[in-house]
Interface confidence: medium
């Protein structure tokens, strides 16, 4: 598999609608919860927790803060760690308990506590309960939660010092917790928590499972530096530990090494940076993506691999575990354990099977299926991804979130359009074409170019958002901006699923943001755009110049991944002629103008599509050089020299249908624009005064011109 | 004070339809799902529909779907349930229901209104 | 469906005693169990959530208990007032309610 391509398009901040929101003085807006039935977005920052407008984020409902005393900062401090920055309070858990409450945890200046916010008041209770294994002291330290029937699950550090990890339920009639035991969890570094529910019509009676994803120092692999490897472990909803043997811990918790690796290059990505459960009615076992870059990152590597669940659960129902065994110097090694394994199976949930054997809950379950769990809870067989390749990789970013919104074409076709967010604040949009991956567009959402810290997407039909959050504020974006799309042609070749060319209206439209019927929607997701009306006008700019000036002619051509050339008269412009430069790798530059260089200038654009070259016409350009004479000016008019040597521009209409390229142009290659020869010195005619259009009374003529095609597609 | 109060009693022949309604006062009634639950006349409880605060998901039991219509109208507090094809089976009182959930969908209920009885007979 | 199981429909205790109703269900259902009580000529009321959480304003004399597939709403020093039948629901799943038990004061 190559690596994917850069983005077709870039969008920068100011160029798309983006919302956002933030606070003076607030940071760290890492936690987000949504609300789609009340349209809610809850916001956990720093000492703080806000409710907006989810619809209009820049609109704030609510705000509560939660801040640190003097005396606890103080305390803090003395600890070694700094009053400014660690020492206040980092909201890490923002749960739902019901209508009108939310679970809250934050650091607390590294004593962690948690509270309800009641949201008709919004207002905390002020339970003050202790955080401590629900959220992490340090604010620098991992976490992970999820909250499933008024339990929360946590994985996160259990003490000041962070070296004591703990994935645990906290629970008022069974709360349980992992093994304070290298085999268990050895230095986790906690990604993502959540729960998937049984299947309604689940014939063996089984149990939900809350699924943990995180990157710990293997103990399988020894090395001379430390391995890290990916996990996915699991623990039963139903779970109430021991009766002896792991009295109040998990009996039911299992881990497994998660694979993602390119098999041809041996490319292994061992650092698990995000997980999302894609969850659709036409799926009958979710699905999860995880984000990866590899261990020693130098190049800026990411990879995404998807799993089906159905794929973990069977590592953990049917797989061989590993068990360590001693060598020499006492030195710990893990193997494939081959022996007996006792039964029920160890780790197993209670299902139907079992409770007919009598085993009702893990409080019955015999000693001897405890202990192997307790000493073998890492699982020799890998969970290994779908079609056993990543679904992306990319080079030059750090990815570092990502969210999956599963949506169908026009033509029926189902796509898993990935939103990646990366350490420079952008947002990249990919989806996999015939076992390609095309980046749809990278939208930059934070200006600052900062790391973006969580990323939600929303769901609700009609109104679909991605929430973006990072240190300085939120920005919510649209899954799609295809009314950017100006052209039926650039329409089809976004390749976008959620985009299609109107006709009618002449407008690229959201597929999905409309009730009204698809009919006469145009999409084409292999690119094809020879699917599009023919245009039979289209607009023109006329632009008259000076002898002996510079002309910029503009070409406004936003894909990344098409080549743009300028044709004069039909004929191709050359790169070499020093007559010629481009701006920004598209504007087209013509130097010492003259009455020869009048006529019609083209900007086309080349881009592969699979094995086809679309051309497209991005612009054209009725040029006219005018021998300016100096005019009579009156004592007290001001004088001023115009850039450029421009008189005036005016639009025309006229056809826009391409004529085919021959041969190579002045053209953007990717290495940038060419080098431009030097200014020519201004000339007597280049002082104009700004009364010049009356000098040209020809210009106020209005003709409209229309240029014949010469399309031979 | 939470209050949901459903319209009066009435009694349908088999194959006739009924609009009930419930008026809900004392909370913000466009923050919760809202769901209807009959008991029949040997007092069994039984969940008959669900919608979620916004309207934008629809539940039923298995019974009553594609005879019954389950609506919201927040700006008017009221929710609503359109009873047609009415049979026997269906004589019981049905209460309004609000689900506390923060998701909706939880399924639980934590204030009923007093009840509408609904007798189907010929 | 998930079939929720009252195995007793009556119940007899004297004011002071302590009462103890189960509740069976078909599968595992965790933690996600409800308890009403309906007093005669009244609409049910939320008495337990989540198997154990009191609902506002119940008194602590009724206590949920249980996980899985089997649970207990429990009763501590019966009053009078406590007179009404007792439901147990469901909601892993579309909502399914026990047949409930009646508690009479001897």
């Known amino acids: 598999m190559a690596f994917a391509p850069i983005p077709r398009i870039t969008w920068e901040h100011r160029e798309v609608h983006l919302v956002q929101f933030h606070e003076p003085d607030i940071y760290n807006y890492s936690a987000l919860l949504l609300s789609e039935d009340k349209d809610t977005l809850y916001i956990g920052a720093r000492e703080a927790v806000f409710a907006v407008n989810a619809l209009n984020i820049s609109e704030k409902q609510h705000e509560v803060y939660w801040k640190v005393s003097e005396d606890k900062k103080a305390k803090c401090a003395e600890k070694g760690k700094s009053k400014q920055t660690e020492c206040l309070n980092y909201i890490r858990v923002l749960q739902p308990l019901s209508a009108t409450s939310l679970y809250v945890c934050g650091t607390n200046a590294f004593q962690p506590a948690c509270d309800h916010l009641n949201l008709t008041s919004f207002k905390f209770l002020g339970k003050n309960e202790d955080g401590k294994g629900r959220c992490p002291f340090d604010p620098a330290h991992s976490y992970t939660s999820v909250m499933v029937d008024g339990e929360l699950y946590s994985g996160t550090s259990y003490n000041f010092l962070g070296s004591e990890p703990i994935i645990s339920r906290n629970s008022s009639h069974s709360p349980l917790r992992t093994e304070y035991a290298i085999p268990w969890l050895n230095e986790p570094s906690f990604v993502f928590a959540d729960v998937i529910r049984k299947s309604p019509d689940s014939p063996d009676g089984e149990d939900d499972r809350v699924y943990f994803f995180f990157t710990e120092v293997s103990v399988e692999y020894e090395f001379v530096f430390r391995v890290l490897i990916p996990r996915i472990a699991r623990v039963c909803k139903g779970d109430q530990g021991g009766l002896r043997t792991l009295q109040k811990k998990w009996t039911s918790f299992l881990k497994a090494r998660l694979i993602c690796s390119r098999p041809d290059s041996g490319l292994v990505f061992n650092v698990l940076r995000d997980v999302f459960v894609l969850r659709s009615p036409g799926l009958k076992v979710p699905v999860f993506y995880a984000l990866f870059t590899p261990q020693l990152n130098n190049v800026g590597l990411s990879a995404v691999c998807a799993y089906n669940l159905s794929t973990a659960e069977e590592v953990f129902s049917h797989g061989k575990y590993m068990q360590s065994t001693t060598v020499e110097q006492s030195h710990t090694k893990w193997v494939r354990y081959n022996g007996p394994v006792p039964k029920p199976r160890p780790g197993a949930c209670i299902d139907s099977e079992a409770r007919a054997a009598n085993y009702t809950s893990s409080l019955n379950l015999p000693d001897k299926t405890l202990q192997f769990v307790k000493d073998h809870p890492l699982m020799d067989d890998s969970v290994t991804p779908i079609d056993n390749r990543p679904r992306l990789i990319k080079k030059d970013v750090n990815y570092t979130q990502i969210v999956v919104d599963r949506t169908q074409a026009l033509d029926g076709t189902v796509y898993d359009v990935m939103f990646v967010s990366t350490d420079r604040g952008a947002l990249h949009k990919a989806i996999s074409l015939e076992h390609a991956v095309h980046i749809i567009e990278e939208t930059q959402l934070f200006q600052d170019f900062e790391p973006v810290q969580t990323l939600l997407l929303s769901s609700k039909k009609g109104n679909r958002f991605v929430y973006a959050g990072s240190n300085s504020g939120v920005v919510q974006a649209p899954l799609a901006f295809c009314g950017k799309h100006g052209t039926c042609e650039d329409c089809v070749l976004a390749r976008d699923p959620y985009c299609a060319w109107s006709p009618p209206t002449a407008t690229c439209v959201a597929l999905h943001q409309t009730e009204s019927p698809s009919r006469g929607l145009i999409q084409e997701m292999s690119g094809d755009a020879s699917v599009c009306p023919d245009k039979s006008k289209g607009s023109y700019r006329q632009h008259f110049f000076k002898h002996g000036g510079t002309a910029e002619l503009k070409c406004s051509q936003k894909s990344n991944l098409a080549r743009v050339f300028w044709k004069f008269q039909n004929g191709v412009l050359k790169a070499e002629s020093p007559k010629y430069g481009l701006m920004g790798r598209k504007n087209l530059l013509i130097f010492n103008l003259s009455e020869g260089d009048s006529g019609v200038y083209q900007c086309l654009s080349e881009e592969r599509v699979k094995n086809k070259t679309v051309f497209q016409v991005v612009a054209k350009h009725v040029l006219e050089v005018k021998v300016v004479p100096k005019p009579v000016v009156a004592p007290t008019l001001s004088v001023v020299q115009t850039e450029g040597s421009r008189i005036a521009t005016k639009v025309l209409v006229a056809s826009t249908q391409g004529s085919s390229p021959p041969t190579p142009a002045v053209q953007a290659t990717s290495s940038g624009a060419i080098t431009l020869p030097p200014k020519p010195a201004p000339t007597g005619t280049s002082c104009e005064p700004k009364i010049v259009i009356n000098t040209v009374p020809q210009l106020h003529s209005e003709k409209t011109m229309y240029l014949k095609s010469s399309d031979n597609r | 004070d939470v209050k949901l109060v459903e319209s009066g009693e009435d009694l349908v022949k088999p194959g006739g339809s009924l609009k009930v309604s419930c008026a809900a006062s004392?909370?913000?009634?466009?923050?919760?799902?809202m769901s209807w639950v009959r008991q029949t006349p040997e007092k069994r409880l039984e969940w008959v529909a669900y919608?979620?605060?916004?309207?934008?998901?629809?539940y039923y039991a298995d019974s009553v779907k594609g005879r019954f219509t389950i609506s919201r109208d927040n700006a008017r507090n009221t929710l609503y349930l359109q009873m047609t094809s009415l049979r026997s089976e269906d004589t019981a009182m049905y209460f309004c229901?609000?689900?506390?959930?923060?998701?909706?969908?939880?399924?639980?209920?934590?204030?009923w209104g007093q009840g509408t009885s609904l007798t189907v007979s010929s | 469906d998930i079939v929720m199981t009252q195995s007793h429909k009556f119940m007899s205790a004297s004011v002071g005693d302590r009462v103890s109703i189960t509740c069976k269900a078909s599968?595992?259902?965790?933690?996600?169990v409800a308890w009403y009580q309906q007093k005669p000529g009244q609409s049910p009321k939320l008495l337990i959530y989540?198997?154990?959480t009191r609902h506002t304003g119940v008194p602590d004399r009724f206590t949920g208990s249980g996980s899985g597939t089997d649970f207990t709403l429990t009763i501590n020093n019966v009053q009078s007032e406590d007179l009404a039948d007792y439901f147990c629901?469901?909601?892993?799943?579309?909502?399914?309610f026990g047949g409930g038990t009646k508690l009479e004061i001897k």
């Open positions: 629901q469901q909601y892993s799943n579309y909502p399914t």
């Open positions: 599968q595992d259902v965790g933690a996600t």
């Open positions: 919608i979620s605060s916004g309207g934008d998901y629809i």
């Open positions: 229901t609000r689900d506390p959930s923060f998701y909706g969908r939880g399924y639980y209920f934590d204030y």
């Open positions: 004392g909370f913000t009634f466009r923050d919760y799902a």
């Open positions: 989540w198997a154990s």
